[in-house]
């Protein structure tokens, strides 16, 4: 991954914090709840982007070359945005305009654009859709996706908080 200009860490931190809050507002748990655990078997990881040790999102990895980690976060945001655009969230029960879900979608797009290098190719994913006999899955899937997104955003927010605290270029006073 080539080194390119660093993102606006402070703005990313603010947006990711806001996203965390929106994700919880969009799907507040019924009771006490732990975030989904990340330790899955290799064969069940499938296509869900997870921020892992080898992604360079630790303090040293970010210092050496933050682009590895940022690429992983970009992939994750694109993956979840794709799911939020799918039939799972578009079908009944319909989501109200300006609902927490709509705000979440808009903010997810905002952070993606902030991180998206101009020449970055868009990855194509197949849109999941539910057949008429699978409609019962929709509320469960919405819950499942949002829970997973909450876990992903919690880690991303920590990355941006660290970046804002340690990697922001100091302002050079002009004469």
């Amino acid at each position: 991954v080539p080194r390119s200009s660093s993102p606006d860490w402070a703005q990313c931190q603010q947006l990711s914090r806001n996203l965390c809050m929106l994700a919880w507002n969009a799907h507040a748990p019924a009771g006490h709840m732990n975030l989904l655990r990340e330790e899955e078997d290799e064969e069940t990881k499938n296509n869900v982007p997870r921020i892992q040790c080898e992604d360079g999102c630790d303090p040293q990895g970010l210092k050496d070359n933050s682009q590895f980690c940022l690429q992983r976060i970009r992939q994750g945001l694109a993956f979840y945005k794709h799911l939020l655009d799918s039939d799972i969230f578009k079908g009944e029960p319909a989501l109200l305009p300006d609902s927490p879900m709509e705000q979440l979608h808009t903010s997810l797009l905002g952070l993606s654009q902030l991180l998206q290098p101009e020449d970055h190719p868009r990855e194509t994913q197949q849109m999941p859709s539910l057949s008429s006999s699978q409609q019962w899955q929709r509320p469960l899937l919405r819950s499942k996706i949002l829970r997973s997104l909450q876990a992903f955003l919690a880690i991303a927010a920590r990355v941006f908080a660290h970046g804002a605290a340690t990697l922001t270029e100091p302002l050079v006073p002009t004469a």
Partner: nanobody, 124 residues
Framework: EVQLVESGGGLVQAGGSLRLSCAAS????????MGWFRQAPGKEREFVAA????????YYANSVKGRFTISRDNAKNTVYLQMSGLKPEDTAVYYC?????????????????WGQGTQVTVSS
């Protein structure tokens, strides 16, 4: 892999009650939700109810809403289906299933674990 064992099925009169249990073992930390499904002779397996393992949110098929209650005891790694106001059309083999948190495009799909089933017969 999660292993599931159902119990509690049997023969009951219409209007009666039964409580099914599903004991889970193995990698239960990777489970997103537990569900109950049923299959009547000559029919496809259908969704009955589900509960998220961690949050305890519940979901029901319209046909059982108000009559069936799904609950869980995380300490015992067990999920229950309390069935009341049973009707002859509730007669079926009831299956317990565990849905993994890792598959985000389907629930209780190919990566789910299934029990062997327990027979529920409601006589009129």
């Amino acid at each position: 892999e999660v292993q599931l064992v159902e119990s509690g099925g049997g023969l009951v009169q219409a209007g009666g009650s039964l409580r099914l249990s599903c004991a889970a073992s193995g990698r239960t930390f990777s489970v997103y939700a537990m569900g109950w499904f049923r299959q009547a002779p000559g029919k496809e397996r259908e969704f009955v109810a589900a509960i998220t393992w961690s949050g305890g949110e519940t979901y029901y098929a319209n046909s059982v809403k108000g009559r069936f209650t799904i609950s869980r005891d995380n300490a015992k790694n067990t999920v229950y289906l309390q069935m009341s106001g049973l009707k002859p059309e509730d007669t079926a083999v009831y299956y317990c299933a565990a849905d993994p948190s890792s598959d985000l495009v389907t629930v209780f799909g190919d990566s789910a674990s299934w029990g062997q089933g327990t027979q529920v017969t409601v006589s009129s």
